[in-house]
């Protein structure tokens, strides 16, 4: 019988193979880590020659080359050092901004022996633009250089390196770019589970956050989340059972579903499993339509009688075929519910493709995801309803083209992977959605749809109130914990008196708790320089009420994300090692950043905060404010850094009675509490009982109105202090 | 804490049966792969046969196919080993052992229950 | 029913290291579990899943698996690890494999 030679040694690797020197057998080659085998695979002909993929001649020596990381190829507005024209595992490369400019990222960058970069793509930035310059990742090259509204830029990566994520990318309205960003990676490079674990998990997790989650439930058997919502979330599990899938690969592929199976099914969502295993042909082993797919028992018993057999007659790899067995699961659902009815349009649908190489039948599965988001009428207002993770496992034939082109593309997102082989995906799937360490992580989701009460929109809002009339508005941080304004105590009343007034889905009044304990600033003295002319100073006006009881967390009542904690890292889905700079950085980016506030009737209005030269100009009103600052000769004294500025243009003014509550920014559908009102120049709501009537200040008013809130970035020291075993802070 | 209780070992002529039983607590047992491991006096572990969570697919060794059953039941969180035409050979330590979701990766034993099998 | 070969025994003194090997085809593309075994008693895992230490199972416990090769190492070995230990992974069509067994003797 024909056999292939045996002399395919590689110097300084080792080799396996399928089915020893028989023709149609694979040859694979491993390095060890920090080194990639060129060739990677040879394949034993019917001739008995072993050919190599790609290869002009039949038979080149194998060697294990160094793995390297691609340079930079253009840095804007700063510069990098060392210049090379690509970095060897262990390298680094350092970035530094022009004077004006602010580093976004991270300054100093090190290769990894998957050839990857570590840390986030930097960026010097002015916030000029509407949206943040969004980069260039090492390796790529960008044309376009406005971020106005609407317009684009356009990515491609140098020499033989593939680009993953959004080759274009627009500046949407709300200020974000549209899609992912791209990065450029060699092509035999990898992810570590450890890098995927965490992407995976954070993009989960915002879709289970999405979902509207309500009360933590404690079990005996570790702890849950349960959510509960009118929507409903589909899973599909796309298993891979082609020739090239060995027994060993497809069982560990189906533990790995069935742990992410139990994770889903632990946080007591309602959750449909859908599970397929392709080869040739698709294998709809339980469909979404089946009443038993919201049965963990069911779903993993029809992964573990999944069987590896099922697919010997047919062995190619028909991603498209298995993607269009999700698309008429979809239509079939979509005829059964109608639709027009919300509970057709409530679903968000989460597909994972587990593959171990390209699509090589079938057509491109490209037509049947575009068939897929065409059904479920995926747009700008509808992206968060359909996930699909493309998952790629092995190191040999997968295609970072294909399984980009799969994956969705969402702002700080990634949904294309690949591992180098299924024991790292079993890895990831353990590790993604660490109940334990999501339980408390759902911050900052308000509720957007236009049929939602003002409280569902903003339930992190409490009302502060003495015995009789109501005084200050505050915000919840935590199930117990209120961070409201230090002025609102000055008269010193006992807080025994005080009630807190929570939202409750069973009564519009909300519902009334006790203080525990207030703590409030030391640093507060609103007479503290009465002698220098300014009779009144609002530094350090910022105070914790501790309530007597937890609040039972609601629809209408959830803390706000506290920038600069892992629970807020989570929501604004950035890397783990993020710092609270990156989060400033991120969050106040721009000179001119929307942000809101909650009116007395529980209306969120609008405003701009100042920052940069733009913080400068607004403050400096302040001295035209002769009342209370008679003989003030400079403006910091009064509008220290402490402070966040807003009044300008077309802004709302806080009234007296709100202050102390929060001032939010939306990013990526969740909320995040930048400040506190604090005190203004004018108010609004003066000389009328009614809670809905606002007056503008005429535009002849001198001083114009000003506002300022206090900048939770510069109370860091004192929030940590009190909260440190509340919330979990990151490093500064 | 998880635990696993073997009991119904003991002694039996060659050719008779035997029903083995494993209670498991700690743990939900619903979701998780299950085996039984023999060890015969101064020998070495051998496996004998596991059955997925929901009982749904049975394994045998060899040496005990057609003789030995394993089932499950969920709602009582029991396993079983039902033993027929047993031979002087069988006579071990059997071990209820807990694996994975559908991988036999043990990580939890029991105490193990004693068959003799002699005449 | 594939095989996992390991050494009948090995010997080490107090406060070195014990190494115990378990071989078998493409070991390493599967995950082994290792169990330590001493007279009387039933098997207690000591690593699972390549190179998970369950809980209450001293540090200087640790496993390996690449190649065709599986390695659990016990540094700074103490008298009360002498015991059997025994190797387990998957085999083909839903069997489980057990390794011979491995008898550590700590030197008096």
């Known amino acids: 019988a024909t056999s292939c030679p045996q002399n395919v040694n590689i110097s300084g690797g080792t080799f396996t193979l399928s089915h020893g020197w028989a023709p149609g057998s694979l040859l694979i080659y491993s390095c060890p880590q920090g080194l990639y085998p060129s060739p990677a695979s040879r394949l034993c002909k019917s001739s008995g020659q072993w050919q190599t993929p790609r290869a002009t001649r039949s038979l080149t020596k194998a060697v294990c080359k160094p793995v390297r990381c691609p340079a930079p190829v253009s840095f804007e507005n700063g510069i990098y050092t060392p210049r090379l024209g690509s970095y060897p595992v262990g390298g680094n490369v350092s970035f530094e901004c022009e004077d004006g400019f602010i580093l976004r990222g991270s300054p100093v960058r090190q290769c990894r022996p998957n050839g990857m970069w570590d840390g986030e793509t930097a960026v010097c930035d002015n916030g000029a633009g509407h949206c943040p310059n969004p980069g260039i990742s090492l390796g790529a090259v960008r044309t376009g250089s406005r971020f106005g509204h609407g317009d684009k830029v356009r990515y491609r990566c140098s020499s033989n390196l593939v680009l993953t994520g959004s080759a274009e990318r627009e500046c949407q309205g709300n200020g974000v770019w549209s899609g992912t960003e791209p990065i450029c990676r060699q092509p035999y490079s990898y992810d570590f589970p450890e890098d995927v674990a965490p992407a995976l998990g954070t993009s989960f997790s915002h879709m289970l956050g999405a979902t509207n989650p309500t009360q933590r439930t404690k079990e005996s058997l570790g702890r849950k989340i349960q959510i509960q919502r009118s929507g409903h979330l589909n899973l599909y599990l796309l298993l891979d059972s082609s020739q090239s899938v060995s027994e060993n690969d497809f069982l560990i592929f189906k533990e790995s579903a069935s742990l992410m199976v139990d994770r889903i099914f632990s946080f007591e969502i309602n959750v449909s499993v859908a599970i397929i295993t392709f080869a040739s042909e698709p294998k709809v082993l339980m469909s979404v339509l089946n009443v038993n797919s919201r049965d963990i028992t069911e779903v993993i018993s029809s992964l573990e009688n999944a069987k590896y057999k099922d697919h010997e007659n047919g062995t190619g790899t028909n991603t498209y075929a298995a993607l269009n067995s999700v698309y008429l699961m979809m239509n079939n659902q979509m005829q059964l519910l109608g639709m027009k009815t919300m509970a057709w349009q409530e679903i968000r649908h989460a597909i994972i493709l587990l593959t171990d190489g390209k699509s090589n039948m079938g057509g491109s599965p490209k037509t049947a995801v575009d068939q897929i988001r065409e059904i479920l009428n995926i747009n700008q207002k509808r992206n968060d309803y359909l996930d699909i993770y493309a998952i790629g496992v092995g190191k040999l034939d997968v295609d970072w083209r294909e399984l980009n082109e799969l994956g969705s593309k969402k702002d700080g997102e990634r949904h294309a992977f690949i591992l180098q082989d299924t024991k790292a995906l079993h890895q990831v799937f353990e590790h993604m959605l660490d109940v334990s360490k999501l339980t408390d992580t759902i911050c900052g989701v308000g509720n957007m749809s236009a049929n939602a009460s003002d409280q569902e929109r903003t339930p992190w809002h409490v009302t502060i109130k003495p015995k009789s009339q109501e005084t200050c508005r505050g915000a919840l941080i935590s199930d117990q914990w209120v961070l409201t304004a230090a002025h609102c105590f000055r008269d010193g009343n006992d807080h025994s008196l005080w009630r807190v007034n929570v939202g409750d889905p069973k009564s519009q009044w909300g519902k009334e708790f006790l203080i525990e304990k207030a703590v409030i600033s030391p640093g507060f003295d609103v007479f503290a320089k009465k002698n220098q002319g300014i009779l009144e100073f609002y530094g350090d006006d910022i105070a914790l009420l501790k309530l007597a009881q937890k609040v039972k967390m609601s629809t209408h009542a959830r803390p706000i994300c506290l920038p600069c904690t892992m629970e807020a890292n989570l929501a604004l889905r950035r890397p783990q090692g993020s710092t609270c700079r990156d989060h400033e950085n991120e969050l106040l980016n721009k000179q001119s950043v929307p942000a809101h506030f909650v009116a007395l009737n529980g209306s969120k209005l609008n405003i701009n905060l100042k920052m940069g030269v733009e913080w400068t100009s607004c403050a400096e009103v302040v001295s035209q404010e002769k009342t209370m600052f008679p003989n003030l000769t400079d403006v910091r004294e009064v509008v220290t850094d402490q402070f966040l500025c807003s009044g300008t243009q077309e802004d709302e003014s806080p009234c007296k009675g709100e202050s102390g509550g929060a001032v939010f920014l939306e990013r990526r559908f969740r909320f995040f509490q930048v400040g506190l009102v604090s005190w203004g120049l004018y108010n609004p709501c003066l000389g009328s009982a009614d809670k809905n009537s606002r007056k503008r200040a005429p535009r002849s008013k001198v001083p114009p109105p000003r506002d300022f809130h206090i900048n939770l970035f510069r109370m860091q020291p004192w929030l940590r202090q009190h909260l440190g075993d509340v919330l979990n802070f990151l490093p500064l | 804490e998880v635990q696993l209780l073997e009991s119904g070992g003991g002694l039996v002529q060659p050719g008779g049966s035997l029903r083995l039983s494993c209670a498991a607590s700690?743990?939900?047992?619903?979701?998780?792969?299950m085996m039984w491991v023999r060890q015969a006096p101064g020998k070495g572990l051998e496996w004998v046969s596991s059955?997925?969570?929901?009982?749904?697919?049975?394994n045998y060794a060899d040496s005990v196919k057609g003789r030995f059953t394993i089932s499950r039941d969920n709602s009582k969180n029991t396993l079983y080993l039902q033993m027929n035409s047993l031979r002087a050979e069988d006579t071990a330590t059997y071990y209820c052992?807990?694996?994975?979701?559908?991988?036999?990766?043990?990580?939890?034993w029991g105490q193990g229950t004693l068959v003799t099998v002699s005449s | 029913q594939s095989a996992l070969t390991q050494p009948p025994s090995v010997s080490v003194s107090p406060g070195q290291t014990a190494t115990i090997t378990c071989s078998g085809d493409?070991?390493?593309?599967?995950?082994v579990s290792w169990y330590q075994q001493k007279p009387g008693q039933s098997p207690v895992v000591v690593i699972f899943?390549?190179?998970k230490r369950p809980s209450g199972i001293p540090e200087r416990f640790s496993g390996s698996n690449s190649g065709n090769t599986a390695t659990l190492t016990i540094s700074g070995t103490q008298a009360m690890d002498e015991a059997d230990y025994y190797c387990?992974?998957?085999?083909?069509?839903?069997?489980?494999?057990f390794g011979g067994g491995t008898k550590l003797t700590v030197l008096r």
């Open positions: 059955i997925g969570s929901s009982g749904g697919t049975t």
């Open positions: 899943q390549d190179i």
């Open positions: 700690g743990f939900t047992f619903s979701r998780y792969y």
């Open positions: 052992a807990k694996g994975g979701m559908v991988l036999g990766v043990v990580n939890i």
């Open positions: 493409k070991l390493g593309e599967k995950y």
């Open positions: 387990q992974t998957w085999g083909t069509g839903g069997i489980q494999v």
